[in-house]
């Protein structure tokens, strides 16, 4: 069993701990509690992305963070396996990969993570609110399933109600903070200029003490002002459901693996380069974000455009474990 104290050099973006600023004392006990409670609990991560070029194209990536060896991965959509989910792909480390429409390409990325590209049009195409699930069967841990869907901000072209979003994004807070500072600076400069215009020109006298130049005080949005911000998110249509592909499901035993070429079973030992979408540079806000991570005892997320997402072959690892009882 692993403990969540092992942290790779880089992780996929973790939620910035914006609220932790004034809670330094709260953060350390939480992190310690997290480490204690989560020692030995396997974790599954699911990443869902909609390709910017084709709206009906999705990339699903899943990973298992545990010490066991993976014997089978099942990817489904429409919900978990026991709740009406439809199998899209099955990946076996030795017998290869089997996939069903609209899955286009399923592959092993590392020994403990997989990726699946979906595309489709018509009845079998995925939509923005589809839930994708990955089930990892591993020895000795057993089987573990996790699901994910597109984050609310990723739904393109849908109407946004005036309700607040569940998360005030760290980068948004940073942008607003910087904008606020600039706005404050501009207003202050205008104010100074106006005062300078209306004042009679002072006589030039050698002064012994140079007057202190007034300093514009940089401000960051307070907790109250952050809370007042409304970030719209997209409405979700519930009519979209994956077409039932029951006929395509593997019903028989392992015989269906027989037709697969042996190379399909090869799993890369190192991480596959994930270069389909460049990592956005966070700009000056990165330093603030990193400071917050440091406070919480977490490693900062990626900080620039030229970085590989997962240098550790075991994929991303979230330090933040289960919730502690308060």
């Amino acid at each position: 069993m692993r403990t969540e104290a092992q942290v790779p050099a880089l992780q996929p973006p973790e939620p910035g701990l914006e609220g932790a600023m004034g809670h330094r004392t709260l953060v350390l006990p939480w992190v310690l509690l997290t480490l204690c409670v989560t020692a030995g609990t396997p974790e599954v991560w699911v990443q869902v992305r909609m390709e910017a070029t084709e709206l009906s194209s999705f990339t699903i990536r899943c990973g298992f963070l545990g010490s066991g060896s993976i014997s089978l991965v099942t990817v489904s959509w429409g919900g978990p396996n026991g709740a009406g989910g439809t199998t899209l792909a099955v990946l076996h480390p030795e017998r290869g990969i089997r996939q069903w429409a609209p899955a286009r390409q399923a592959r092993w990325e590392t020994q403990s993570s997989i990726s699946l590209i979906l595309e489709g049009s018509g009845a079998s195409s995925p939509c923005a609110n589809t839930t994708f699930c990955c089930k990892f069967a591993s020895f000795p841990e057993g089987s573990w399933e996790a699901c994910g869907s597109l984050p609310p901000s990723s739904d393109p072209g849908l109407s946004a109600p005036p309700t607040p979003a569940p998360i005030l994004r760290a980068d948004l807070a940073g942008i607003l903070g910087v904008s606020g500072v600039l706005l404050f600076g501009c207003v202050y400069l205008l104010h100074l200029l106006r005062r300078h215009k209306h004042r009679p020109a002072p006589r030039l006298q050698p002064s012994r003490t140079s007057p202190q130049a007034p300093r514009a005080r940089a401000w960051a949005p307070s907790q109250a002002s952050q809370a007042a911000l409304h970030v719209p998110y997209a409405t979700i249509n519930t009519s979209c459901r994956p077409a039932t592909l029951d006929t395509a499901h593997p019903h028989g035993g392992p015989s269906w693996w027989a037709s697969l070429p042996t190379h399909a079973a090869h799993r890369p030992q190192g991480p596959a380069a994930w270069a389909s979408t460049p990592i956005p540079a966070r700009g000056s806000f990165v330093s603030v974000e990193n400071g917050l991570y440091a406070q919480a005892g977490e490693r900062p997320p990626h900080t620039g455009p030229g970085l590989t997402l997962f240098p550790d072959p075991r994929g991303p690892r979230a330090m933040e474990g289960p919730l502690g009882v308060r």
Partner: nanobody, 119 residues
Framework: QVQLVESGGGLVQSGGSLRLSCAAS????????MGWFRQAPGKEREFVGR??????????SYADFVKGRFTLYGNQARNTVYLQMNSLKPEDAAVYYC??????????WGKGTLVTVSS
Amino acid sequence: QVQLVESGGGLVQSGGSLRLSCAASGRTRSMYVMGWFRQAPGKEREFVGRIKWSGDTTYTSYADFVKGRFTLYGNQARNTVYLQMNSLKPEDAAVYYCNLRRLDGVNYWGKGTLVTVSS
């Protein structure tokens, strides 16, 4: 203030399935972890599983006793999290509590939903 409302509990036969749901309302803006705990009569409250959203990635973690029988999933846009429970055993009978932890470390609990498993 955040309100959590659990639903979906009830009586089920051993080996059966149930889906619990938890809807969060109120000031959930800084929410980033939602999870489930359970408490059987005369026992301490124990962790079942948790889900954490981070951009386009969802992290899910379970207690060891789950062993692939339960699946935790959610809809971030709707502030809802579900616990799909399959192959239920009599020892799974308990009051299941939803928990939400905000970025500032504040914890919120639901009132709980009772799950009874008959053998």
